[in-house]
Interface confidence: medium
């Protein structure tokens, strides 16, 4: 593991049954309690869940665990010190770290990814730091919907 320290978890919010749409960014509409930014919608959880639970919860909201395009994607919440499950896991079949959609992790995103334990899942901090942790650990998570 690298030296980044996880701080205490701060609860945030949960999606309610209300799915009114909001025009949260220049080119997309998001559900209530989701943040709209650069044509994506993000749900920042407060519940702590295992990686698998997180994945299923995102799927139930017609989204997926966060797949990062670049390390400044979450700069709207860069003040957060928390770590969140993202949609990155190791594929034994492909012997590579893959996003949920099957695409490979760019070595430029997490230069230290070669030191990650392949049995673990990845928790990410919006400042650009990543940790490998047991997938059975409980963390907050971030769901993402790409609307364009």
């Amino acid at each position: 593991k690298n030296s980044f320290t996880k701080l205490s978890i701060e609860p945030a919010f949960t999606p309610g049954p209300n799915i009114e749409l909001q025009k949260d960014s220049d080119c997309c509409s998001c559900q209530e309690k989701w943040v709209g930014y650069r044509c994506n919608c993000y749900f920042i959880s407060s519940e702590q869940k295992t990686w698998n639970e997180s994945r299923h919860l995102c799927a139930s909201q017609k989204s997926s665990l966060l797949q990062l395009q670049n390390t400044d994607e979450l700069d709207f919440m860069s003040s957060s010190q928390q770590f969140y499950w993202i949609g990155l896991s190791y594929s034994e079949e492909h012997t590579a770290w893959l996003w949920e959609n099957g695409s490979a992790l760019s070595q430029y995103l997490f230069p230290s990814f070669e030191t990650f334990n392949t049995k673990n899942c990845i928790a990410y901090n919006p400042n650009g730091n990543a940790l490998d942790e047991s997938c059975e650990d409980k963390n907050r998570y971030i769901c993402k919907q790409q609307l364009i």
Epitope: A12, T14, P17, E20, K23, D24, V35, S46, E47
Partner: antibody
């Protein structure tokens, strides 16, 4: 340090429209990580959420008041407003504006000073 | 909508004692519950969010616990300034709702 300053009349006649404004200072109302809300409290009673708004103009209302409530935002003035139509004596209350974070507490963390509004002819 | 029921309605205690306030939700709100303190003529002040996390500047004698439907606010050792009305609030689902309040008064 974000502060919320409320303004508006303290007396409204029955059947008229109650209008209040909340001005945000020390921060931008256009931040994508906050909702801005209105809550009221009838004399000697508990708190009731009226509704919330996002800087984009998306609104979320309490179903019990939805038919009479309009919340709007003016990002150029860094303020948001509450209109409650067809008021009756039952709408007499202290009205508060407040901030609701999307990525932190998700509980009303900063409140305005409150405006006592009396509905009377 | 989710109904929050607070008990007791009034709690009479002396400074230095321990206060335990309860908030029960009509259905699960997970940990999406907050506690507020309100003194006469003032706006409510956020004490606890996420059921157990203290808001900025809140003394550590205030603590929250619970998840699902049953929540507790505990004040470990009452100070004179703690006597006030306490409300719980949920946003487990829309609409946001508040409990009816517990009045903490000096015995």
């Amino acid at each position: 340090q974000v502060q919320l300053q409320q303004s508006g009349p303290g007396l409204v006649k029955p059947s008229e429209t109650l209008s209040l404004t909340c001005t945000v200072s020390g921060g931008s109302i256009s931040s994508i990580i906050y909702y801005w809300g209105w809550i009221r409290q009838p004399p000697g009673k508990g708190l009731e959420w009226i509704g919330s708004i996002y800087y984009s103009g998306s609104t979320y209302y309490n179903p019990s008041l939805k038919s009479r409530v309009t919340i709007s935002v003016d990002t150029s003035k860094n303020q948001f407003s509450l209109n409650l139509s067809s008021v009756t004596a039952a709408d007499t209350a202290v009205y508060y504006c407040a901030r609701l974070p999307l990525t932190g507490e998700f509980a009303f963390d900063i409140w305005g000073q409150g405006t006592m509004v009396t509905v009377s002819s | 909508e989710i109904v929050l029921t607070q008990s007791p309605a009034t709690l009479s205690l002396s400074p230095g004692e321990r206060a335990t306030l309860s908030c029960r939700a009509s259905q699960s709100v997970s940990t999406y519950l907050a506690w507020f303190q309100q003194k006469p003529g003032q706006a409510p002040r956020l004490l606890i969010y996420g059921a157990s996390s203290r808001a900025t500047g809140i003394p550590d004698r205030f603590s929250g616990s619970g998840s699902g439907t049953d929540f507790t606010l505990t004040i470990s050792r009452l100070e004179p300034e703690d006597f006030a009305v306490y409300y719980c609030q949920q946003y487990g689902s829309s609409p946001i709702t508040f409990g009816q309040g517990t009045r903490l008064e000096i015995k």
